[in-house]
Amino acid sequence: IIDGYKCKEGSHPWQVALLKGNQLHCGGVLVDKYWVLTAAHCKMGQYQVQLGSDKIGDQSAQKIKATKSFRHPGYSTKTHVNDIMLVRLDEPVKMSSKVEAVQLPEHCEPPGTSCTVSGWGTTTSPDVTFPSDLMCSDVKLISSRECKKVYKDLLGKTMLCAGIPDSKTNTCNGDSGGPLVCNDTLQGLVSWGTYPCGQPNDPGVYTQVCKYKRWVMETMKTHR
């Protein structure tokens, strides 16, 4: 997260880190005791999932292995559409005040809605600085019409844009797959953005979760 702030401790109990060994690979969101939602471009053969801590690499955090993941069948590495994936944990999480599932959306929030994005991604760009603490940024949803002025044909119908006019605050490497939460519901998953990160008036681009609720529910049901 560029130009963000340290999240209030325990305020994001659904936030997970997908680790490759001990190294941050992507963010993710707990949606069920067995399931983590993340970006399809974060796919690996297996994952070490850290839950229940705002500190990356926290020894006291829950760490659960995951060996199965299900990309959206329509994910395209060419157009980056349908950048969403479910990761099935090998064992259920122990729910607590520090570990909770996020609320999936009942509807799509409109442009102008205030939201918070979080992650352990680099706080500087192009040189990388990975924080140990979970970082947050407060952003507002931007209309597709406005966002298309910046990204033109790269912006797909199920992509959501967010940012703050003239501000550098945004997502970056390592934040991918992490949550954009608006009015206590998951509205977006970090998908992509301009590099170097933090260029004013280049919004962050997210997978619009409200358009995928049926797929999420059906996939979890199929692979119970």
Epitope: A39, H41, S125, P126, N173, V190, S191, W192, T194, Y195
Partner: antibody, heavy 128, light 108 residues
Framework: QLQLQESGPGLVKPSETLSLTCTVS??????????WGWIRQPPGKGLEWIGS???????YYNPSLKSRVTISVDTSKNQFSLKLSSVTAADTAVYYC????????????????????WGKGTTVTVSS | DIQMTQSPSTLSASVGDRVTITCRAS??????LAWYQQKPGKAPKLLIY???SLESGVPSRFSGSGSGTEFTLTISSLQPDDFATYYC??????????FGGGTKVEIK
């Protein structure tokens, strides 16, 4: 200041495998922001992209060479390597390693990068 | 694959001249074009990326323009150090990165 240096044999026999290594100094290859690529230039000719690799090991190859190319990365040594099998005289060229600077991060990153830092190049001749 | 066609292949000019090199893509590449300068026996050096963004440390006499399929590299006032071969490269497609055939700028 980032520097790249190619190394490997200058002479390779036809049908054998060409192996080159690029050593990166002045910066870490494991920065998740960048791609690391190989480009070649036959004598008196233009530039041809061979392929690239990300710090995590995701590879992208030129389809015309894909069946013969392997690019790998060794983050512990701050190096990445090229292997080109079944070489012929047509593979004689100056081989450059280079860093790919992305225009986007995340899902869109690997299609939009340009080579911003290059090695000096190493000449490889394929001859018996 | 996207083909990149540069013109002219050779250009004779004098110090102080305004020089223009054109690069055409076989299909639209938006603004995903870079320009490189290469001197004999040396590696290419990045001049311009994203069609018109000047790489850090490159003199302001170099400029790039264009989008879609037609692009231009302009040297506003040619200096002795500018005699070299120039290549364009497209990096905005799902096919491989491809370079133009090069334009050699030589002394008139």
């Amino acid at each position: 200041q980032l520097q790249l240096q190619e190394s490997g044999p200058g002479l390779v026999k036809p049908s054998e495998t060409l192996s080159l290594t690029c050593t990166v100094s002045g910066g870490s290859i494991s920065s998740s922001s960048y791609y690391w690529g190989w480009i070649r230039q036959p004598p008196g000719k233009g530039l041809e992209w061979i392929g690239s690799i990300s710090y995590s090991g995701s590879t992208y190859y030129n389809p015309s060479l894909k069946s013969r190319v392997t690019i790998s990365v060794d983050t512990s040594k701050n190096q990445f390597s090229l292997k080109l099998s079944s070489v012929t005289a047509a593979d004689t060229a100056v081989y450059y390693c280079a860093r790919g600077a992305p225009t986007y991060f995340g899902a869109a990153s690997h299609y939009y990068y340009y080579m911003d830092v290059w090695g000096k190049g190493t000449t490889v001749t394929v001859s018996s | 694959d996207i083909q990149m066609t540069q013109s002219p292949s050779t250009l004779s000019a004098s110090v102080g001249d305004r020089v223009t090199i054109t690069c055409r893509a076989s299909q639209s590449i938006s603004s995903w074009l870079a320009w490189y300068q290469q001197k004999p026996g040396k590696a290419p050096k990045l001049l311009i990326y994203k069609a018109s963004s000047l790489e850090s440390g490159v003199p302001s006499r170099f400029s790039g323009s264009g989008s879609g399929t037609e692009f231009t590299l302009t040297i506003s006032s040619l200096q002795p150090d500018d005699f070299a071969t120039y290549y364009c490269e497209q990096y905005g497609s799902y096919s491989p990165l491809t370079f133009g055939g090069g334009t050699k700028v030589e002394i008139k």
